[in-house]
Each structure stands twice: as structure tokens, then as C-alpha cells.
Interface confidence: low
């Protein structure tokens, strides 16, 4: 429905608090280097303008699109050229090209300092001093570091962040109360950001059809009692929401997400029996809860799929009349019967089915041609099952840290051109699949593991896209969204790679390693491991293990020494020499 003033419409729908928060997120996701104060100023100006439009929708400029209003505001930033370089050229363009230009300049790995958590008392003072500014800073710092973070979900995180400080800053032991909550929010936030990044990549790199297919499969698993038409309606609405958020239309996205939650709760009887608790919560919690809700029970006595999709004489007729609807029905029916499959596996099966029908419906005897299509599914199902079984066994044998190290070696050998920080980050995250998924029973392992791996490999893809260095990574990332993981799994050692020259400086360590947290110390050691493999890609597991064991012993010894720095200098030289000898460097 058309509104005279889009900005007034959204302000009224969302309310001032959410309006301001979402505009701040939008601006911080576009201009990631701008200081907080500059963004707050811009947001306040937009908010004051929106209020004039609420009072009089016919007032000057109130009829302009949100992209025009926001883009004009962003282009008033004085230091645009100095801070952002060619991004400033976006301002010479007209909408919609200007917004597209801003979107293209979003940086998944912005050059921003690591967020260091201050002392609890310092944070509590800041919170008590000016709660509103404190929470705005949270939104700003997360949004600028995660330019695709799902904005309405970030509002939910901010609400929990506020609740944590409200409760813990008056607790007897503030730190014991607050720090675990902040750790949980940080970890959940990173996971949420990465999941949303995959949705945006799916939409932007592979198109709406790819995203809709993903949504059909996931919602059919989650709501197996819902009719196909109901699932289709939810998929259409969900696609609109994510298209808007990924496109920077955060006000529309948040508004539409609220409408979708309202619709789901008003129609929960025809969607899922698991929604009752979610639907009793306030808006932000409700939307989050629906997004995370467990799968409903499968209806009893579902008929065999073969009748409609293999045995029927009308398969080719049905396919020809409405290809996407027919394939959508196939995906819906298959997914609702298989909560034990990953979404990407379901999409591979649907793709195989589509390819078979394309070929067979043009053949002399279509039925004879596609009669065995379900047999083609068997190896596709067994491949991830076997891979997960093997890797969970390895994880249980090694534990998370050493399992991560095994993956570091594996992936460095596959794609040694990728930067060391990216290999460490991605391999550490790949390794977390063990503790995240291997504890689950068989029926939940694959959807947990393979869909998580899709999210992590997408991180590799978006980081690599910024600075492409490996044709193999580009190939696996761009050829097929659903086959990314099998593509990376199939990569062998890159025989074309010329080993990196040995540089002793890379393996020189100092006493500061002793004061690092366990996690940071692991990252240091894993960075060294990647560099070792880059120097000696043909090193055996045994050789690498021996060097890493020596390295761990060296760190432990020097951290216990009275003169740590001297120990690191002298023992470090010996370690480098011994490692070179052991690896034949």
C-alpha cells in the first residue's frame, strides 16, 4: 500500500526508539569507518526530519524514498573521499545506482581495532552514566564490524545486552554475573552474523531462486504439518524480509519481519504446534524464538514420495506446466520427511531430480529414463554421512584444539595461497563443528554439521572475494552454493604451490605470549602451524606433530623461566634450528 511519506510510515510503524536504532545500524553498516559521534548526529537529523513528516506528510522532501533520504544524508559526510576513497564516487550517482554502489563497498573485514572489553567496573560506570549512549555504541560497534548483521536481530541482542548490564551492575560480584553473559552474546552474535552473511550471499550471488529453495527446504523441515501453500507464503514473505535487510532497507525489513511474526502467530494452528511459547513473548523475543523454533513432529503415515514424483504418468506434464512449483513441491515433500538431512543435501537432491527431469522429459521414453532417479540419491546421502562419521571420530579422538589443527593442516595444503589469518579463523571455526554437532544423535548430526559448515565456508568465500588469491577457492565458492562443501572436501594438496621462503622472524616468539588468554595462545600456535605448512607443504603429520609438540614445550618452559625474554630468544633459536632440521627446510 502506497504511503505519501515512506519515512513517516516507517517511523509510525516502528516507533522512535527502533527507528533511531535501525537508522544508526544502517549508517554504521554503510560508513564503517565513521566516528560514533558523526553517526549519532546524522541519525538525530534524520529522526527530526521524520518527525516533521509524521506531523505533515506533505511537507517538503517527505515524499522522497528512504534510499534518497539516507543516501543524501550519508553523502554530506565531509571526509568521505579521505576516509573511503572511491566509495565517495557513489555520491555522484542517482538512486537506485547510488545505493547499489554503497552496498558494493561494504567491507566484510574492515580495518578496525579489535574490540577490547574494558574492566567490568568501567563498563558499569559507562552504562550508569549514559545508558542510551552506551547501548547506541554497542549497536554502532557491532554494525560497523558486521555490515550484513540482521538488523532486527541486532535490536534483540541490544535488548539482552541492556538486560545483562541492568542486572549485573547491581550484583555483588559484577564480573561473575556479567562476563559469562557477554561471552554468550559475543559468541551468539558472531554465529548470527555468519548465518545472515550466508543468506545475503545466497541472495546476492545466486539470486532469489536459490534463497527461496533454501527457505522451502528449511521451513518444510521445521513445519512439516503445514500445507505446501502455507510454506510457500512463508517463504515469499521471508524472502522479502531478507532481501530488504541484505539490500540495506532496514526499516522495511524490521517492519516486515514484525508483520511476518504476527502472521505466523495468528496462524500457528496451520503452521506448527511448537510456536505457542514463542507467540506469547514480546516482539523482538518472539521473532527470534520463531526463527530458532524446533522442528514440529512429522505427520503420521505420509505416503511414499515415489508415487507422485516417479511412478505417476503425469510427472513430465506437471513439471512442464510449472517447473518451479513442481520442484518446490518435491523439495517440500522431501524435506518434511527428512529432518535428518542437511538443507544443502536436500537442495542437492532437488537439483539432481531437476537435472534428471530436464534430460528425461525430452527422451523417447521419459518414465523409463527417470524411473531410477531415487537411486541416484544414495551416494549423495552417503557422502556427508560418511564424512561426518569420520570427522566426529577424529574429533572425539583428538579434542577440539588438535582437531582444529588437523583441519588447519588439511586446508592449508588445499589452498596455501589464502592468507594465514583467514586460514586460522576459518579452520578454527570449521573445527568447532565437533563440539557443536558430534554430541548429537545420528538423526541430528547432519543438519547440524553440514549446514554449519556452509556458514563457515561462506566466511572463507566472502573474505577471499575481497582479495582473491586462489583460483581453487574462487571455483568452489562460485560454481554452486550447495556444492561448496563437497568441492572443498574434494580438493587435494595443491601441487602447483611454490613453498614460501623460510623466515625466522615468523617463528620468533616473545614473553608476551605468556600473558595471553588460552584462546589467543592457541591462535599464535595455530598461526605458526599454518606458516610451517606453507613452508613445507609436503611435511607429514608426524613431522608437524613433532615440531608442534616441541613448540608447546618451548612456550611452557619459557613461560616458567625467571628471565622469560632471554629464554624465548635463546631457546627460540634452538627450536627454529631443530624444526628446520626435522622438516628439511
Amino acid at each position: 500500500d502506497a504511503h505519501k511519506s515512506e519515512v513517516a510510515h516507517r517511523f509510525k510503524d516502528l516507533g522512535e526508539e527502533n527507528f533511531k536504532a535501525l537508522v544508526l545500524i544502517a549508517f554504521a553498516q554503510y560508513l564503517q569507518q565513521c566516528p560514533f559521534e558523526d553517526h549519532v548526529k546524522l541519525v538525530n537529523e534524520v529522526t527530526e526530519f521524520a518527525k516533521t513528516c509524521v506531523a505533515d506528510e506533505s511537507a517538503e522532501n517527505c515524499d522522497k524514498s528512504l534510499h534518497t533520504l539516507f543516501g543524501d544524508k550519508l553523502c554530506t559526510v565531509a571526509t568521505l573521499r579521505e576516509t573511503y576513497g572511491e566509495m565517495a564516487d557513489c555520491c555522484a550517482k542517482q538512486e537506485p545506482e547510488r545505493n547499489e554502489c554503497f552496498l558494493q563497498h561494504k567491507d566484510d573485514n574492515p580495518n578496525l581495532p579489535r574490540l577490547v572489553r574494558p574492566e567490568v567496573d568501567v563498563m558499569c560506570t559507562a552504562f550508569h552514566d549514559n545508558e542510551e549512549t552506551f547501548l547506541k555504541k554497542y549497536l554502532y560497534e557491532i554494525a560497523r564490524r558486521h555490515p550484513y548483521f540482521y538488523a532486527p536481530e541486532l535490536l534483540f541482542f541490544a535488548k539482552r545486552y541492556k538486560a545483562a548490564f541492568t542486572e549485573c551492575c547491581q550484583a555483588a560480584d559484577k564480573a561473575a554475573c556479567l562476563l559469562p553473559k557477554l561471552d554468550e552474546l559475543r559468541d551468539e552474535g558472531k554465529a548470527s552474523s555468519a548465518k545472515q552473511r550466508l543468506k545475503c550471499a545466497s541472495l546476492q550471488k545466486f539470486g532469489e531462486r536459490a534463497f527461496k529453495a533454501w527457505a522451502v527446504a528449511r521451513l518444510s523441515q521445521r513445519f512439516p504439518k503445514a500445507e505446501f501453500a502455507e510454506v510457500s507464503k512463508l517463504v515469499t514473505d521471508l524472502t522479502k524480509v531478507h532481501t530488504e535487510c541484505c539490500h540495506g532497507d532496514l526499516l522495511e525489513c524490521a517492519d516486515d519481519r514484525a508483520d511476518l511474526a504476527k502472521y505466523i502467530c495468528e496462524n500457528q494452528d496451520s503452521i506448527s504446534s511448537k510456536l505457542k511459547e514463542c507467540c506469547e513473548k514480546p516482539l523482538l523475543e518472539k521473532s527470534h524464538c520463531i526463527a530458532e523454533v524446533e522442528n514440529d513432529e512429522m505427520p503420521a503415515d505420509l505416503p511414499s514420495l515415489a508415487a507422485d514424483f516417479v511412478e505417476s504418468k503425469d510427472v513430465c506434464k506437471n513439471y512442464a506446466e510449472a517447473k518451479d512449483v513442481f520442484l518446490g513441491m518435491f523439495l517440500y515433500e522431501y524435506a518434511r520427511r527428512h529432518p535428518d538431512y542437511s538443507v544443502v543435501l536436500l537442495l542437492r537432491l532437488a537439483k539432481t531430480y531437476e537435472t534428471t527431469l530436464e534430460k528425461c522429459c525430452a527422451a523417447a521414453d521419459p518414465h523409463e529414463c527417470y524411473a531410477k532417479v531415487f537411486d541416484e540419491f544414495k551416494p549423495l546421502v552417503e557422502e556427508p554421512q560418511n564424512l561426518i562419521k569420520q570427522n566426529c571420530e577424529l574429533f572425539e579422538q583428538l579434542g577440539e584444539y588438535k582437531f582444529q589443527n588437523a583441519l588447519l593442516v588439511r586446508y592449508t595444503k588445499k589452498v596455501p595461497q589464502v592468507s594465514t589469518p583467514t586460514l586460522v579463523e576459518v579452520s578454527r571455526n570449521l573445527g568447532k563443528v565437533g563440539s557443536k554437532c558430534c554430541k548429537h544423535p545420528e538423526a541430528k548430526r547432519m543438519p547440524c554439521a553440514e549446514d554449519y559448515l556452509s556458514v563457515v565456508l561462506n566466511q572463507l568465500c566472502v573474505l577471499h572475494e575481497k582479495t582473491p588469491v586462489s583460483d581453487r577457492v574462487t571455483k568452489c565458492c562460485t560454481e554452486s552454493l550447495v556444492n561448496r562443501r563437497p568441492c572443498f572436501s574434494a580438493l587435494e594438496v595443491d601441487e602447483t604451490y611454490v613453498p614460501k621462503e623460510f623466515n625466522a622472524e615468523t617463528f620468533t616468539f616473545h614473553a608476551d605470549i605468556c600473558t595471553l588468554s588460552e584462546k589467543e595462545r592457541q591462535i599464535k600456535k595455530q598461526t605458526a602451524l599454518v606458516e610451517l605448512v606453507k613452508h613445507k607443504p609436503k611435511a607429514t603429520k608426524e613431522q608437524l606433530k613433532a615440531v608442534m609438540d616441541d613448540f608447546a614445550a618451548f612456550v611452557e618452559k619459557c613461560c616458567k623461566a625467571d628471565d622469560k625474554e632471554t629464554c624465548f630468544a635463546e631457546e627460540g633459536k634452538k627450536l627454529v634450528a631443530a624444526s628446520q632440521a626435522a622438516l628439511g627446510l
Partner: nanobody
């Protein structure tokens, strides 16, 4: 223009005491939380103590708890740090700063005053 001027530093023996002052101007002192930070030779910045605009609550780094006391006089726009039982590891340049700011760093600080604890 915001100005913060620290004073009261000097050389003191271990176990001795010093009182640092910080005169503030150019902003509304009584609506700003303030803090003391210090930088030991060759080390990074370390926060020492924070005081809310009203005078309470106050917070201290573990390393100075029970030995240092932060206070303020809003009528004089002045921040204080009473340092007792000084140790060699308290040797540093002490800065007063206005708090908070956009990046959980300190908005404005003074030139600092050197505290040297040695026998």
C-alpha cells in the same frame, strides 16, 4: 576547549603517600564521570580508578584496591587521587581523563604527572 591539568606527582619512597589533583575546565564537570589512568615506562595504558559524576559509585583496579582513593569536588571542578602504601610498580605517568567516549576509550586527558616510587 576541554582542559585537564594534573598536579601532585613527585618522587616518593616505597610505603609513602601522594595526593594527585586534576583541575578540569571547558566542559560540565558535574555531569561527567572521571577516571585516572596510568602508563608505566615501556608499558601500555592501565586504568586505575573511576568515579561517577555524583561521587559514587567508585571503582578501582585490583592492583590499587585498598591503597588508592578517588574523590571529586564538583564545586571546584577538581578530581583527586589519594595514593597510600606506594610501591615501585606504581611508578608511572598518571593522567586524569573524562569518561566515557564512543569507542570505550577516553575522550580527553591531560598532560599527566609523573609519580616515581624508589628508595
Amino acid at each position: 576547549e576541554v582542559q585537564l591539568l594534573e598536579s601532585g606527582g613527585g618522587v616518593v619512597q616505597p610505603g609513602g603517600s601522594l595526593r594527585l589533583s586534576c583541575a578540569a575546565s571547558g566542559f560540565t564537570f558535574d555531569t561527567s564521570s572521571m577516571l585516572w589512568v596510568r602508563q608505566a615506562p615501556g608499558k601500555g595504558l592501565e586504568w586505575v580508578s573511576v568515579i561517577h559524576q555524583s561521587g559514587t559509585p567508585t571503582y578501582y583496579a585490583d592492583s590499587v584496591k585498598g591503597r588508592f582513593t578517588i574523590s571529586r569536588d564538583n564545586s571546584k571542578n577538581t578530581l583527586y587521587l589519594q595514593m597510600n602504601s606506594l610501591r615501585a610498580e606504581d611508578t608511572a605517568v598518571y593522567y586524569c581523563a573524562k569518561f566515557p567516549s564512543s569507542r570505550m576509550k577516553f575522550d580527553y586527558w591531560g598532560q599527566g604527572t609523573l609519580v616515581q616510587v624508589s628508595s
